[in-house]
Amino acid sequence: LIIGFGISGRHSITVTTVASAGNIGEDGILSCTFEPDIKLSDIVIQWLKEGVLGLVHEFKEGKDELSEQDEMFRGRTAVFADQVIVGNASLRLKNVQLTDAGTYKCYIITSKGKGNANLEYKTGAFSMPEVNVDYNASSETLRCEAPRWFPQPTVVWASQVDQGANFSEVSNTSFELNSENVTMKVVSVLYNVTINNTYSCMIENDIAKATGDIKVTESEIKRRSHLQLLNSKAS
């Protein structure tokens, strides 16, 4: 969490941002909140990016002001216009690109004063893994697949019964480049699995960590998966 304060002249206002990560090819949100004002027409929101000459986005007098916008962000940015009045200056970013990563500044002017805060935005690819029994294999085998990851993640298998066991000798992981030549499909196979056990396939890079669980019994197969973004720090 980064909390910034305003500069000289007018009073300073508190601006708060949260470091976050964007999934390339999908929509992203850069979070920023500020002390609200009672009049929308008195609020100016500017988003800037380190190393970029033009503005990322500007919203003033209740509408977008994009004359100074950098070409890199043209057609891809918006704020939540109906939430600005309550102090939400978060930026929507359409179709996140790898190059969108970097340090952003959320700069706010209201009738109460000015304030700004920085935000670290990471970009990559992350997706939920799905673990299935591989019935085509000669022995009891599990197959863990996740369609989109970048940078290349690590894959670790774990089991509820054999806690702490190292499965690297009985697993095989491959990474297949997707058609857009950036993200990769992750496939990991675990051999010699036993029945009545819960296995977990954990995929992690510096942006996200995802786990796919599977429990195989004589009568049923239960699956569960979850994903968490790493390093979501507020400023």
Epitope: D64, L66, E71, G75, R76, A81
Partner: antibody
Framework: QVQLQQSGAELMKPGASVKISCKAT????????IEWVKQRPGHGLEWIGE????????KYNEKFKTKATFTADTSSNTAYMQLSSLTSEDSAVYYC??????????????WGQGTTLTVSS | QAVVTQESALTTSPGETVTLTCRSS?????????ANWVQEKPDHLFTGLIG???NRPPGVPARFSGSLIGDKAALTITGTQTEDEAIYFC?????????FGGGTKLTVL
């Protein structure tokens, strides 16, 4: 006034490729997304994907990833969609539409007149 | 992929108010789905009516309005006119792709 003018009807043989054009007039071409949509009788509308002409950023519907390729020429304000390895399933009317993404306005506001593609041997 | 469902057909009379709805198979429609409504008239004539749930592009008559009603997106035509007879499609955005509904054939008798 804002207009999208598409190329004319096409009759193609199976296995061939076709390139459909969509010429934009009356606005800043580079700042708006061009969406591509397929319409087949009984199948409603299907989103093929989109391109942002200024940056060339594209997004494809998974179903059309190997079928369609989008390009845009900002000097002529024209967007293109190439469809490859044509089959009878590709016979349809194809539309381009302008999509504006902003804080206050975000909508499909202008559509081309459609390009009819017939694939037949 | 999500499925977007609309009424297949509705009938109304001139001057009446009619509401068309748009449901998502993934749960409640929210403002993040940027619900769009598009009108199709004969000869492949498409017009964007509503975007971002409730935004009306310039030139679209004020009788067309968009909203969220319960867990669905809705298009309301207040004081329907005979020229509003058409097929109405809704489109919902799912973070990285659009999905269109099957369309509602509106008859104005």
């Amino acid at each position: 006034q804002v207009q999208l003018q598409q190329s004319g009807a096409e009759l193609m043989k199976p296995g061939a490729s076709v390139k459909i054009s969509c010429k934009a007039t009356g606005y800043t071409f580079s700042s708006y997304w061009i969406e591509w949509v397929k319409q087949r009788p009984g199948h409603g509308l299907e989103w093929i994907g989109e391109i942002l002409p200024g940056s060339g950023i594209t997004k494809y519907n998974e179903k059309f990833k190997t079928k369609a390729t989008f390009t845009a020429d900002t000097s002529s304000n024209t967007a293109y969609m190439q469809l490859s390895s044509l089959t009878s399933e590709d016979s349809a009317v194809y539309y381009c539409a302008r999509y504006y993404f902003g804080s206050v306005n975000f909508y499909f506001d202008c559509w081309g007149q459609g390009t009819t593609l017939t694939v037949s041997s | 992929q999500a499925v977007v469902t609309q009424e297949s057909a509705l009938t109304t009379s001139p001057g009446e108010t009619v509401t068309l709805t748009c449901r998502s198979s993934t749960g409640a429609v929210t403002t993040s789905n940027y619900a769009n409504w598009v009108q199709e008239k004969p000869d492949h004539l498409f017009t964007g009516l509503i975007g971002g749930t409730d935004n009306r592009p310039p030139g679209v008559p004020a009788r067309f309005s968009g909203s969220l009603i319960g867990d669905k997106a809705a298009l309301t035509i207040t004081g329907t006119q005979t020229e509003d007879e058409a097929i109405y499609f809704c489109a919902l955005w799912y973070s990285n792709h659009w999905v269109f509904g099957g369309g509602t054939k509106l008859t104005v008798l």
